[in-house]
């Protein structure tokens, strides 16, 4: 079998949902010593970066300015050390937002409900679209999809305090081109009296995986690595 290097990690810096005409930044984290990184878009080569010096950095950033629907889609990356290529990274879906119109989001029976009540979100957009998306802020990877001509419903079932938080919806023109976001709707779920004080609110942390953790290797790191390698050999 043909030998390959471990696959790199691809991430979007800050978010994978990029407003049109703004810049997207994708990070490809591979290996120290990689002499070339390639970014692929829908299976075709999109961009190349050759780190300098290659032994000092474990990844690169690819900048995609002026985001539009032609640049929205599935990205992956690979890297090369010497003549040996890595496996392909997982696919990353890059979405362009702020296309066309703004939907309206509402919630029934209302934004303040009791734990156990059934809640339904409604997303309405008069422009022709068939797919709607509901996202909870801080959980942007957990996208709920629903279909309808001008309106879609998102039944949440009996809610718990874990459903608390701010929601937005989008109309989608295809998988990678979304409308402007709706105004947020904040869902407040109160628990049973004896549970209320213990019920955690769902913190809307930023999407912590949407950060680029590229590091430069310092001389000290190199010395420590060499020392550790020597120590391991001595122990053997």
């Amino acid at each position: 079998p043909k030998q390959t290097l471990p696959k790199p990690i691809i991430r979007a810096e800050s978010t994978y949902m990029v407003p049109k005409e703004k810049q997207a930044t994708l990070c490809c984290q591979g290996s120290y010593g990689a002499v070339e990184y390639q970014l692929h878009f829908e299976g075709s080569l999109f961009a190349v970066e050759r780190p300098k010096p290659p032994e000092r950095i474990n990844g690169v950033k690819f900048h995609i300015p002026d985001m539009n629907s032609r640049k929205a889609g599935r990205y992956s990356c690979i890297y090369r050390v010497g003549e040996l290529w890595s496996e392909r990274s997982d696919l990353l879906d890059l979405v362009v937002t702020e296309m066309y119109d703004t939907p309206t989001l509402s919630v029934h029976p209302g934004p303040e409900v009791t734990s156990g009540e059934k809640v339904t979100f409604y997303c309405r957009l008069d422009t022709a679209t068939s797919m709607f998306l509901l996202l909870k802020e801080g959980r942007s990877r957990d996208v709920q999809r629903s279909y309808g001509k001008v309106q879609a419903e998102f039944p949440m079932g009996p809610v718990t305090t874990a459903h608390r938080g701010s929601y937005r919806c989008f109309g989608s023109y295809n998988n990678y081109a979304w409308s402007f976001p709706s105004e947020p709707v904040k869902l407040l779920v109160t628990g049973d009296i004896e549970n209320t004080s213990l019920a955690p609110t769902d913190p809307t942390f930023p999407d912590s995986w949407d950060t680029c953790l590229l590091t430069r290797e310092t001389g000290l790191q190199k010395d420590l690595a060499l020392w550790d390698h020597t120590a391991q050999n001595l122990l053997r």
Partner: nanobody
Framework: EVQLVESGGGEVQPGGSLRLSCAAS????????MGWFRQAPGKEREFVAA????????YYADSVKGRFTISRDNAKNTVYLQMSSLRAEDTAVYYC????????????????????WGQGTLVTVKP
């Protein structure tokens, strides 16, 4: 707004050479990654060569590697394509393109990456 104007096209015999120039207007040239594409009659536009904004990192299509050289002069806001050992299959309209702005040393290969294009210059290779 960036404007790109190509020049240097013309008719040349197989094995001959040509140098294409692309003059860019605006102060953003130093932050632009640049590329050359070509489109032969009845064919799709294809990538030829590209150069990063700062370190003069380059990338070439396999079909032109070793025969074409891309370079840039940031003082003159110009990118060049030196073409040698020209063949009949190099006949096409050659387009200069820019990605603005860029950071780091990305070299862009996909036409979708480019947000500014020139009008093109025709290169004809025939005996």
């Amino acid at each position: 707004e960036v404007q790109l104007v190509e020049s240097g096209g013309g008719e040349v015999q197989p094995g001959g050479s040509l140098r294409l120039s692309c003059a860019a207007s605006g102060r953003t040239f130093a932050s632009a990654a640049m590329g050359w594409f070509r489109q032969a009659p009845g064919k799709e536009r294809e990538f030829v060569a590209a150069i990063s904004r700062s370190v003069d990192d380059t990338y070439y299509a396999d079909s032109v590697k070793g025969r074409f050289t891309i370079s840039r002069d940031n003082a003159k806001n110009t990118v060049y394509l030196q073409m040698s050992s020209l063949r009949a299959e190099d006949t096409a309209v050659y387009y200069c393109a820019a990605v603005v702005p860029t950071y780091g040393n990305n070299i862009y290969v996909h036409s979708a990456a480019y947000n500014y294009w020139g009008q093109g210059t025709l290169v004809t290779v025939k005996p």
